[in-house]
Amino acid sequence: ELCDDDPPEIPHATFKAMAYKEGTMLNCECKRGFRRIKSGSLYMLCTGNSSHSSWDNQCQCTSSATRNTTKQVTPQPEEQKERKTTEMQSPMQPVDQASLPGHCREPPPWENEATERIYHFVVGQMVYYQCVQGYRALHRGPAESVCKMTHGKTRWTQPQLICTGEMETSQFPGEEKPQASPEGRPESETSCLVTTTDFQIQTEMAATMETSIFTTEYQ
């Protein structure tokens, strides 16, 4: 079942999917001046069996001005890139696919693809949020949103993420220096830490971590 809406928008934050559930579709979009080849796929589809998931179909773009097709890129499981409707950024740490049955990794780029990827998520998909550059999270730990089905309708859970600008640290004379972020994790947490500089979440661990004190209870 496809999710009706996009994941929630959080001020000064972007989201990423670490892996994509089977059934997810990725539009074959081309950058300005290029278009899909005739008879080319409209989208890629994450499909699989009990042991392996991969992207079906291939996206191919050709120049709008010529009839020559560009080199075909076959989707292969690869490093993480960026998420739905944001500019693609530097690769992220690969997720251990073996730990995520029924999921596809981020498809590799195809030649002349658009700068934004448009995904169509399915129920059960989880995405993770981080503050954009220049903003910092008020709370520690991954802020996540999950597409759920309730009463026959799909909805995304709301991540408890507040991203604040760093223009004011307000250290008054005599005030102690701020603590560094703890080196190790407190006993009830795992080793992942999400801040503006660290978004290398291991998906299978992140799902167990807190976002709001009570979101695990609430949601």
Partner: antibody, heavy 114, light 111 residues
Framework: EVQLLESGGGLVQPGGSLRLSCAAS????????MHWVRQAPGKGLEWVSV????????YYADSVKGRFTISRDNSKNTLYLQMNSLRAEDTAVYYC???????WGQGTLVTVSS | QSVLTQPPSASGTPGQRVTISCTGS?????????VHWYQQLPGTAPKLLIY???ERPSGVPDRFSGSKSGTSASLAISGLRSEDEADYYC???????????FGGGTKLTVL
């Protein structure tokens, strides 16, 4: 069970100082931003200050900026509010609150009067 | 004066449905920040009633619901009970203050 317990309130003269403490338990204190919110007698809630989970940044309401200082000790699961140059209008119940704020303490009364 | 605007009072009879409005601006509710609602019973600390616009913490009856649209939000209480008599506050983060802002509170009276 989440618990937030404020202490340090009391009667102080104008211009005086107080240090409030908030002892936290029942959740991973070091993962959450913490707030001080106050409520003057018979009035509504007024946000005072917030500190990020690691203490790396703090923000203050204009009414207390330059006089109050928020801090935290994650090793002790404790939040602090140092209040200097107190004024009569600072008289209120001071609550510490965690997260959204999701949870609140029961509050400690600060009375500024001569 | 509070940054978020609420009616100072509201009332209803048992079993009735009442709504409390909360109006903000482009730096808080209108900026996309979530709205939270708190219930404060006489002589007690505020308690989170609704978070993230329309989510209920466990233990909060489904008689309480929230919604948000544009720069405003509302809290609805259906099947009003005498124990609902309390002060209700809305709150949202404000990016110009870098902190949460509260409504002035609405005193709900069950007639």
């Amino acid at each position: 069970e989440v618990q937030l317990l404020e202490s340090g309130g009391g009667l102080v003269q104008p211009g005086g100082s107080l240090r409030l403490s908030c002892a936290a338990s029942g959740f991973t204190f070091s993962s959450y931003g913490m707030h001080w919110v106050r409520q003057a007698p018979g009035k509504g809630l007024e946000w005072v200050s917030v500190i990020s989970y690691d203490g790396s940044y703090k923000y203050y309401a204009d009414s207390v900026k330059g006089r109050f200082t928020i801090s935290r000790d994650n090793s002790k699961n404790t939040l602090y509010l140092q209040m200097n140059s107190l004024r009569a209008e600072d008289t209120a119940v001071y609550y510490c609150a965690a997260g959204v704020p999701d949870y609140w303490g029961q509050g400690t009364l600060v009375t500024v009067s001569s | 004066q509070s940054v978020l605007t609420q009616p100072p009072s509201a009332s209803g009879t048992p079993g009735q449905r009442v709504t409390i409005s909360c109006t903000g601006s482009s730096s808080n509710i209108g900026a996309g920040y979530d709205v939270h609602w708190y219930q404060q019973l006489p002589g007690t600390a505020p308690k989170l009633l609704i978070y993230s616009n329309n989510e209920r913490p466990s233990g909060v009856p489904d008689r309480f619901s929230g919604s948000k649209s544009g720069t405003s939000a509302s809290l609805a209480i259906s099947g009003l009970r005498s124990e609902d008599e309390a002060d209700y506050y809305c709150a949202a983060w404000d990016n110009s203050l870098n902190g949460p802002v509260f409504g002035g509170g609405t005193k709900l009276t069950v007639l």
